[in-house]
Each structure stands twice: as structure tokens, then as C-alpha cells.
Amino acid sequence: GVFNYETETTSVIPAARLFKAFILDGDNLFPKVAPQAISSVENIEGNGGPGTIKKISFPEGLPFKYVKDRVDEVDHTNFKYNYAVIEGGPIGDTLEKISNEIKIVATPDGGSILKISNKYHTKGDHEVKAEQVKASKEMGETLLRAVESYLLAHSDAYNEQKLISEEDLGGEQKLISEEDLHHHHHH
């Protein structure tokens, strides 16, 4: 069956900057700013666009070893990211996959709202455990706050727009800051 859920959280970081850091460069940032939550992110296939498969590994002591995410859409115009958790972590006997959408919306005060929608695909009539929803929410919050702190401490990061060539990005253009160049890797 299916269970639909959504949650909202706010950030003091402007939408465009947060999208660049949290979504477009999360693979690099997460292990760096939140090593207690994520130990590594590895691209298994694809270049970051739809169809890309990423393996996110968790440090020892956490309930799960890893998850695999499949990127379904990256919308640079509307600051929207769609991906599905397809393997590892909670995926198994009772849960088939989790489809997630993160939409970052600008607020009048210069900050942003993150609207996170989750669609849990369960096997048969299995119910989604409340703890699973809570754990997923907490992980997202941990990563967001870690990225937010990093951005507040590094005011130049993911800010000044400089266009990297298509060749550097494996055929995909995107705006990136001066400092991002140091962290940039091929997707």
C-alpha cells in the first residue's frame, strides 16, 4: 500500500543558496559537515541527473549501514528535488521504497521553507511505523542544520555565481561558487 506524509521546516538561508548547497552539493557537504550522520556518499551510476544511483553510507553505531537513492528529478528553476530510497536502510520485508520530494521556497524575510513530501510504498498491507517516519524526519533535520551552520560560518560559500563549463560537469551546466570549486567532483 501507500502512506503519504509531509513536513515543513524553515531555514534562515535564502532558497537559491540552500538549494545549491543542500541539494546540488549535498554529496560533498554531508560527510564533511555531519560526519556523525553520514560517512560517505558515492555515485554508483549516472551524472547527478534523473536515473543517478547514489549510495549513502552511515557511520557505525547507527541502525542502518547504508541506503541507495535514485534521483528522479532535479528542478533548478523551482528548487525542487525528487528522489527515491530504493535499497538498504528501512527497505526490506515490509517497505518497498520511499519516494521523496524536497521543495525549497523563498520567504519574504530572506530565508526559506523546506517542504518535504514522502510517499511510503509498503509491501501488502503493512503499516508504516511511526518511528520510521520520525527517524527519517530527524535525519533530514540534522543534515539541514549542519549545512545551515556551515553556510552561516562560510558566507562566501555557494554564493558568488560562477559558471563551470559543461565539460567540467560531464555535460551538465550549473552555477557554483568559488569555494565550491574546491569541493567539486564529477557526478
Partner: antibody
Framework: QVQLVESGGGVVQPGRSLRLSCAAS????????IHWVRQAPGKGLEWVAV????????YYGDSVKGRFTISRDNSKTMVYLHMNSLRTEDTAVYYC???????????????WGQGTLVTVSS | EIVLTQSPGTLPLSPGERATLSCRAS???????LAWYQQKPDQAPRLLIY???SRATGIPDRFSGSESGTDFTLTISRLEPEDFAVYYC?????????FGQGTKVEIK
């Protein structure tokens, strides 16, 4: 404007099969889940099935599970409902409906077709 | 499955009057995932409200939705002649997606 047009309804004997079609236009079809909802004569609405935007995920109401199959062809902007082992209680107007939210969907229905009547009778 | 119970079954009112339709859920509807539809005879249903209180495109502001716990309400502030129809609520938090049995708003 968004348009959904169902076809394929008719009179069929119990135990037989029928295939309903839903032709969609006026929106980016490949970005939306499509549902089938039915209404027995003089009765309320009953959700029947859904197919995800990419065709990977399909879910069914308990009363049709194992008998009905939903499919789609994004290149033709068509959705189909294959109905096998039909029963008299399947008699209803069948509507196809567009999900109100793109990609993964939210499972409410913002546009509906005019419906096609399926009568299962011996 | 989540059962939705609508009341009253029939609501006889006159044009210009206020209509209050109720929909009660058998369990919690997280994120206000409830929609309202209007259906006129020999027509397809039409979406009025989603998210318990957000009006769908083109729906006049005399239609409004609200919620309190597991109780949801559709209010039509001043009934127009074209508002006499059957109204259904629908939950979309947990599959199977279910509808209430409907409330018929008829001319008194």
C-alpha cells in the same frame, strides 16, 4: 485545457473481460499519476486503481485486486484498465482521473473524464 | 482502511442559505490530506477543496473547508442554484483512497 476521455465500456457477461481506455490531453501526461474511480448506479464513488507517472507503481482497491490491471503508454498519452473475471457488482460508470500533484502524486483528483458505463449482466 | 462518514445524508436548503456538511474519519488524517468533490446528476465529480481547506482552481470563495481533529467540514456560505448537488469527501493519507458516502444538498 485538460481533457480525459474514457472509452471501451459496454455490456459484458459475468466472467468475461473488457479493456477500458483513457485518452489524455492538455497537460504533461508523463509527469502525472492517473487513477480509475468507479460509481455503481445510484451509489457513491469507489477508488479502483492508480498507476504512477512512469508506470512503475500500480495499486488496486481490494474489490478488484487480482482481476484488474492498470497500464499506461506515455508516448500515446493513454491509460488502460484491463478487467478480467467480471462480476455483476463491477457494473458502474468508470472514470479516469488525473492526480492533483506532479510526479509522485498526492492521490487526490483534480480532473476527471466524463466516464464510461460498464454493465456486467447475463 | 480509513472509513469516512458523511452527515447528514440529505440537506434540504433554500438558495441564499448557508450549508454545513460534515465528514468524520475513523482515524487520524495526517497533514490534512482530505479533499471535497461536487457531483451533479449525469456529470463527473469536480474537485472543490484539497488539503482540507485549499480551494481548487476556479472554485468560488463561497466554498470553504475546515478541520478539527478527525472532523472535517465543507461550508457553502450562500447557496447558489448551481450548488445543489451531491458532495463527497475523500482521504488521501493511506491507501486504499476512500470516499465518504456523500451528502445530497437539495432544494427545500
Amino acid at each position: 485545457q485538460v481533457q480525459l476521455v474514457e472509452s471501451g465500456g459496454g455490456v459484458v457477461q459475468p466472467g468475461r473481460s473488457l479493456r477500458l481506455s483513457c485518452a489524455a490531453s492538455g497537460f504533461t501526461f508523463s509527469r502525472y499519476a492517473i487513477h480509475w474511480v468507479r460509481q455503481a448506479p445510484g451509489k457513491g464513488l469507489e477508488w479502483v486503481a492508480v498507476i504512477s507517472y512512469d508506470g512503475d507503481d500500480k495499486y488496486y482497491g481490494d474489490s478488484v485486486k487480482g482481476r484488474f490491471t492498470i497500464s499506461r503508454d506515455n508516448s500515446k498519452t493513454m491509460v488502460y484498465l484491463h478487467m478480467n473475471s467480471l462480476r455483476t457488482e463491477d457494473t458502474a460508470v468508470y472514470y479516469c482521473a488525473k492526480d492533483g500533484y506532479s510526479l509522485y502524486g498526492k492521490d487526490y483528483f483534480d480532473y476527471w473524464g466524463q466516464g464510461t458505463l460498464v454493465t456486467v449482466s447475463s | 482502511e480509513i472509513v469516512l462518514t458523511q452527515s447528514p445524508g440529505t440537506l434540504p436548503l433554500s438558495p441564499g442559505e448557508r450549508a454545513t456538511l460534515s465528514c468524520r474519519a475513523s482515524q487520524s488524517i495526517t497533514n490534512s490530506y482530505l479533499a471535497w468533490y461536487q457531483q451533479k446528476p449525469d456529470q463527473a465529480p469536480r474537485l472543490l477543496i484539497y488539503g482540507a481547506s485549499s480551494r481548487a482552481t476556479g472554485i468560488p470563495d463561497r466554498f470553504s473547508g475546515s478541520e478539527s481533529g478527525t472532523d472535517f467540514t465543507l461550508t457553502i456560505s450562500r447557496l447558489e442554484p448551481e450548488d445543489f448537488a451531491v458532495y463527497y469527501c475523500q482521504q488521501y493519507v493511506r491507501s486504499p483512497w476512500t470516499f465518504g458516502q456523500g451528502t445530497k444538498v437539495e432544494i427545500k
